[in-house]
């Protein structure tokens, strides 16, 4: 089955700048600003566009050692990024893949809203584990806030 979870979160960072840092340079930035969450991001194949495969490794003590993500779409004009978790982590006997869509929308106050959709593709009749959805959401929030704190302090970065 397919189970869809949608969330919204806000940032004080303008949409274009956040897209540049959080989406386009996340591979470089995440291990630097959130070493407690991501230990490394390795490009397995591709140049960042659709079809690119990345291996994200987690620090010791995490329930999973790594996940592999596949980039599905990068829309620089509309600040949209789609990717799928295809290997490692929770992917296995009951879960085929997780398809994720992130859209960053500018707000009138100069900040932005992140609209996030996570589609869990389970095998057969298997349900999605609530703790996995929660963990995934918390990881996204951790990374966003870490990037936001870095960007607030470095006004010259990612402009």
């Amino acid at each position: 089955g397919v189970f869809n979870y949608e969330t919204e979160t806000t940032s004080v960072i303008p949409a274009a700048r956040l897209f540049k840092a959080f989406i386009l340079d996340g591979d470089n930035l995440f291990p630097k600003v959130a070493p407690q969450a991501i230990s490394s991001v390795e490009n397995i194949e591709g140049n960042g566009g659709p079809g690119t495969i990345k291996k994200i490794s987690f620090p010791e003590g995490f329930p999973f050692k790594y996940v592999k993500d596949r980039v599905d779409e990068v829309d620089h004009t509309n600040f949209k990024y789609n990717y799928s978790v295809i290997e490692g982590g929770p992917i296995g006997d009951t879960l085929e893949k997780i398809s994720n869509e992130i859209k960053i929308v500018a707000t009138p106050d100069g900040g932005s809203i992140l609209k996030i959709s996570n589609k869990y593709h389970t095998k057969g009749d298997h349900e999605v584990k609530a703790e996995q959805v929660k963990a995934s959401k918390e990881m996204g929030e951790t990374l966003l806030r870490a990037v936001e704190s870095y960007l607030l302090a470095h006004s010259d970065a990612y402009n």
Partner: antibody, heavy 119, light 104 residues
């Protein structure tokens, strides 16, 4: 146990060059930013800049840009702060600090290096 | 660049007093604010990170609050070892000027 050990006190003349060091141990040195903080006599704390040893990415605070050079060598788990031409106003205690995992609070500090510049 | 303004610059208090120090950012820093304590001749020590989180090993009489531009460090019952200088700091960036807590 996380430790940052700084090089010893220095007495220099105006115009001299200087490089002080900060050696990390007890953690993955490559994975955490190191900040350098100046404290002039009787004054407060001033962040000079930060370096990420993993790839030597360096960010300077505006008032220190062009005044000092911050670097790191991950192979020896050491960060550096250097001056090409010291002036009397560089007299201060310089601290290195590890920026921790959660929003960069400086959770471990070196003991400080006193730099005295006098003719 | 964002400026951090601390107040008061100094205060006199007695053991057992409740002490409050404030820190204001020139623009929003969300909750990305840290508090440090420094004693004479010593390196600073992290007390609070991300505005309200107590650093491991720090006594629970220390607490932090605030978000956006206005932040507070509170010592609920001042102890003899708490007489020191306290600094706020925006994560990755500027420190406040410091607040000296002296014995009345």
């Amino acid at each position: 146990e996380v430790q940052l050990v700084q090089s010893g006190a220095e007495v220099k003349k105006p115009g001299d060059s200087l490089k002080i060091s900060c050696k990390g141990s007890g953690y993955s040195f490559s994975n955490f930013w190191i900040g350098w903080v100046r404290q002039m006599p009787g004054k407060g704390l001033e962040l000079m800049g930060i370096v990420y040893p993993g790839d030597s990415d360096t960010k300077y605070r505006p008032s220190f840009l062009g005044q000092v050079t911050i670097s790191a060598d991950k192979s020896i788990a050491t960060a550096f702060l250097q001056w090409s031409r010291l002036t009397a106003s560089d007299t201060a205690i310089y601290y290195c600090a590890r920026l921790g995992a959660t929003y960069a609070g400086a959770d471990f500090w070196g003991q400080g290096t006193l730099v005295t510049v006098s003719s | 660049d964002i400026q951090m303004t601390q107040s008061p610059s100094s205060l006199s208090a007695s053991v057992g007093d409740r002490v409050t120090i404030t820190c204001r950012a020139s623009q929003t820093i969300v909750t990305y604010l840290n508090w440090y304590q420094q004693k004479p001749g010593k390196a600073p020590k992290l007390l609070i990170y991300a505005a309200s989180n107590l650093q491991s090993g720090v006594p629970s009489r220390f607490s932090g609050s605030g978000s956006g531009t206005d932040f507070t460090l509170t010592i609920s019952s001042l102890q003899p070892e708490d007489f020191a200088i306290y600094y706020c700091q925006q994560s990755y960036a500027a420190f406040g000027e410091g607040t000296k807590v002296e014995i009345k």
